[in-house]
């Protein structure tokens, strides 16, 4: 995502427009405590990170509070006083929405409506994936709000569902991340189940009259 600068790989994730995580992977500096310096305004002095991420005892990233910001993050990763990598990025283009909350299922015959709490910002897609043990892969449906109706389900089958949120690529660009998936929930005949059988149960033989 960040390309290679002096052998440094950069990754930026803006968690739910709340916290920015910048991580680096620098093979050349693998046993070095690189420092992270940042500012949100090109005219200000750099501040040093106060919340480092560590990997094998060495700095590997920084977490920054950045509530609802859509401006530029200027940052410099340094080895002592020597800048190893300096850059500026529009933070919002690295958005990772939070996982869906309060997921609910409303059944009506062969259809289910999946709802959850909409996030406070827009230009998102709410994706529901579902499958039964008879399906070889997940089916998917997505909407602009967390109100997704899936029709044509077989009331006798057990279905597994999970939900995630994605940033619209035509709005936020190619570098966003989908949210983590919600927990899998299983349903059959409109009732929640602990799990769906991994192998489909064979249909019951019809009793001859």
């Amino acid at each position: 995502q960040g390309g290679a600068a002096e052998g440094v790989q950069i990754q930026i994730i803006y968690f739910n427009l709340e916290t920015v995580q910048v991580t680096w992977n620098a093979s050349k500096y693998s046993r070095t405590n690189l420092t992270f310096h940042y500012r949100f305004n090109g005219d200000e002095a750099y501040d040093q990170c106060t919340n480092y991420l560590l990997q094998e005892g060495h700095t590997s990233g920084c977490l920054l509070d950045a509530e609802q910001r859509d401006d530029i993050l200027y940052f410099s990763i340094r080895n002592g006083t020597h800048p190893v990598f300096t850059a500026s990025r529009w933070m919002v283009y690295y958005l990772k929405p939070s996982s869906p909350k309060h997921v609910r299922f409303s059944w009506h015959q062969d259809a289910v409506t999946v709802t959850c709490s909409d996030l406070s910002y827009g230009d998102l897609l709410y994706e529901v994936q579902y499958r039964s043990p008879f399906d070889t892969e997940w089916q998917s449906k997505q909407e602009n709000t967390c109100n997704v109706t899936i029709e044509g389900l077989d009331a006798e089958k057990c279905y597994s569902f999970w939900v995630r949120v994605k940033a619209m690529e035509d709005v936020y660009g190619p570098d966003t991340y989908p949210s983590d998936w919600s927990e899998v929930t299983c349903w059959q005949r409109g009732e929640i189940r602990d799990a769906c059988a991994e192998t489909p149960t064979p249909p019951k033989p019809k009793l001859s009259k």
Epitope: D70, W90, V92, Y93, V171
Partner: antibody, heavy 118, light 107 residues
């Protein structure tokens, strides 16, 4: 289809003011950072100013800082550049440009000519 | 500010030629480099971003490469519509800066 249409250019005397507008369509304007880039006659491209999607973050080239103000009206899908204390060296075609994240300056308007001369 | 230097400033080529333009940054810009094409009296058009990725709708005869400080734009087989001025731009670090341009003319 993304469209950016600049207007407001013209002839102005040194020390005068001008306000450029850019009408945007075909994309979610409120979520996109936007830029102004200029090109003096027969010369190369120079970045002038940028604004974040919300309008909260604004950025300027040193040559225009304190004289130019970038702003946006998201309900109207319009970007502005207020230019004060204009100088002869501000004479250029001014382009409105959409930001595309790692895709960079991905869409450009056709430009509007500003001439500063007495 | 980061200085971007293009070479050559101009070149003459024939239809069908393979053309290479180079761009050098005054400091490491990772792969945050774009290439633009501009025809006389027209707005610049984005061709390539992050050094080697083609913008949507741009023909595959255009290709870019490089990382760090040295970058190239290649046109594999020059066509009449490709005669124009080409600019590189770094957008790794604000302010974004452009090269001075390379004018590709008909031989």
């Amino acid at each position: 289809e993304v469209q950016l249409l600049e207007s407001g250019g013209g002839l102005v005397q040194p020390g005068g003011s001008l306000r450029l507008s850019c009408a945007a369509s075909g994309f979610t304007f409120r979520s996109s950072a936007m830029h102004w880039v200029r090109q003096a006659p027969g010369k190369g491209l120079k970045w002038v100013s940028s604004v974040s999607g919300s309008g909260a973050g604004t950025y300027y080239a040193d040559s225009v800082k304190g004289r130019f103000t970038i702003s946006r009206d998201n309900p109207k899908n319009t970007l502005y550049l207020q230019m004060n204390s204009l100088r002869a060296e501000d004479t250029a075609v001014y382009y409105c440009v959409k930001e595309g994240g790692s895709r960079g300056f991905d869409y450009w308007g056709q430009g509007t000519l500003v001439t500063v001369s007495s | 500010d980061i200085q971007m230097t293009q070479s050559p400033s101009s070149l003459s080529a024939s239809v069908g030629d393979r053309v290479t333009i180079t761009c050098r940054a005054s400091q490491d810009i990772s792969n945050y480099l774009a290439w633009f094409q501009q025809k006389p009296g027209k707005a610049p058009k984005s061709l390539i971003y992050t050094a080697s990725s083609l913008q949507s709708g741009v023909p595959s005869k255009f290709s870019g490469s490089g990382s760090g400080t040295d970058f190239t734009l290649t046109i594999s087989s020059l066509q009449p519509e490709d005669f124009a001025t080409y600019y590189c731009q770094q957008y790794n670090l604000y302010p974004p800066t452009f090269g001075q341009g390379t004018k590709v003319e008909i031989k």
